[in-house]
């Protein structure tokens, strides 16, 4: 199972649920669904309040029980370490895969933290991060921001990933904007 890590804004916008949580339990495999279940302790929710309704406490995260079908394997044994988890809701349960955005909170730049906390959501409705995988590539729309990190280095370590968000500049136009300047 291979997938290119998305820009964090794309991960935020395409996910039903974005939370901060600690992985606290030993994984279990459900013998009916063949999904692996990790016990988590949620510390913050950044997206998904409406989708979840009253069931606002997520206690488990689910993933396929085998690597080759994109199952997520949690390598850290540090139960106090917080992770940013962006996943999909299926039947009210949080599901993630290898392709999901799951990262130690401490590994995120301050700009990314700000993005997940308040700014990425501003770009979700109108703007699209458009991956540029090979040269030449051109904008398909004024609401697209060309993401060129992959051309230069690892996509999740690039400048645009770590410091920028694709946000509306005016109606019908989105541009890369520094998350540093978003401090209110």
């Amino acid at each position: 199972c291979t997938c290119v890590p998305p820009h964090p804004q794309t991960a935020f916008c395409n996910s039903d649920l974005v939370i901060r949580a600690k992985f606290v339990g030993t994984p279990e495999v459900n013998q009916t669904t063949l999904y692996q279940r990790y016990e988590i302790k949620m510390t913050k929710m950044y997206k998904g309040f409406q989708a979840l309704g009253d069931a606002a406490d997520i206690r488990f995260v689910y993933t396929p029980a085998m690597e080759s079908v994109c199952g997520y394997f949690h390598r850290s044994h540090n139960r106090s370490e917080e992770f940013l988890i962006a996943g999909k809701l299926q039947d009210g349960l949080l599901h993630i895969t290898t392709c999901s955005f799951v990262a130690p909170w401490n590994s995120l730049s301050l700009a990314q933290r700000r993005g997940f906390t308040k700014t990425y959501t501003v770009g979700c409705e109108e703007c699209t991060v458009f991956p540029c995988l090979s040269i030449p590539c051109k904008l398909q729309s004024g609401t697209h921001c060309l993401w060129t990190d992959q051309l230069l280095q690892g996509s999740e370590k690039g400048f645009q990933s770590r410091h920028l968000a694709c946000l509306p500049r005016e109606p019908g136009l989105c541009t890369w904007q520094s998350l540093r300047s978003q401090i209110a």
Epitope: T26, P27, V29, Q31, T32, T33, L34, Y35, Q36, P64, A65, M66, E67, S68, V69, G71, F73
Partner: antibody
């Protein structure tokens, strides 16, 4: 009484196809994941494939991926294994198992020219 | 391509206790509490004897017990009886290969 009965085994030429069936009774079939496990003559057990209760998730051993397809019909309480591009090394007794607690008696598949 | 390592054979006299080991890695045996043990008599289907490391299905004699330490699981049979003579296989969940078996151990009851 919980019972699993395999059928569909037999002699097939290399490159040929075969479809195994496993009829289940005595339990709520859709509530259990099911597996196929094989055992070559005089050898140990080898997991082949598994499928979730709903049929929505399927897993395969590397040795059969792309050649074998596991499926189930919950309305008929039946598990299937479609085996294509068979090789001599696929020769084995194939067991159907209710996620590895209850096993059928097995059906012999022989791949030979 | 055997994933879990078991001794090829073990023997004991009636009434004795024997232990069969099953050694894996931190990715399978050591990483999860999903180790099962199966008994197989010649020409018969495997029968589940122990699941989830140490649990016995109903109908299985309490002479059979399972345990785990680190990356090694063990099956102990106490008060050995003639009908215990069979092949024994360990099996573990593994995230990469999903399900892995040991190579099997032939148990011989002497005398």
């Amino acid at each position: 009484q919980v019972q699993l009965v395999e059928s569909g085994g037999g002699l097939v030429q290399p490159g040929g196809s075969l479809r195994l069936s496993c009829a289940a009774s005595g339990f709520t079939f859709s509530s259990y994941a099911m597996s196929w496990v094989r055992q070559a003559p005089g050898k140990g057990l080898e997991w082949v494939s598994a499928i979730s209760g709903s049929g929505g998730s399927t897993y395969y051993a590397d040795s059969v991926k792309g050649r074998f397809t596991i499926s189930r019909d919950n309305s008929k309480n039946t598990l299937y294994l479609q085996m294509n591009s068979l090789r001599a090394e696929d020769t084995a007794v194939y067991y159907c198992a209710r996620f590895l607690d209850i096993w059928g008696q097995g059906t012999l598949v022989t791949v030979s020219s | 391509d055997i994933a879990l390592t078991q001794p090829a054979s073990v023997s004991g006299s009636p009434g004795q206790s024997i232990t069969i080991s099953c050694t894996g890695t931190s990715s399978d045996v050591g990483g999860y509490n999903y180790v099962s043990w199966y008994q197989q008599h010649p020409g018969k289907a495997p029968k589940l004897m122990i699941y989830d490391v140490s649990n016995r299905p109903s109908g299985v004699s309490n002479r059979f017990s399972g345990s785990k330490s680190g990356n090694t699981a063990s099956l102990t049979i106490s008060g050995l009886q003639a009908e215990d003579e069979a092949d024994y296989y360990c099996q573990s969940y593994d995230f990469v290969r999903f399900m892995v078996f040991g190579g099997g151990t032939k148990l011989t009851v002497l005398g």
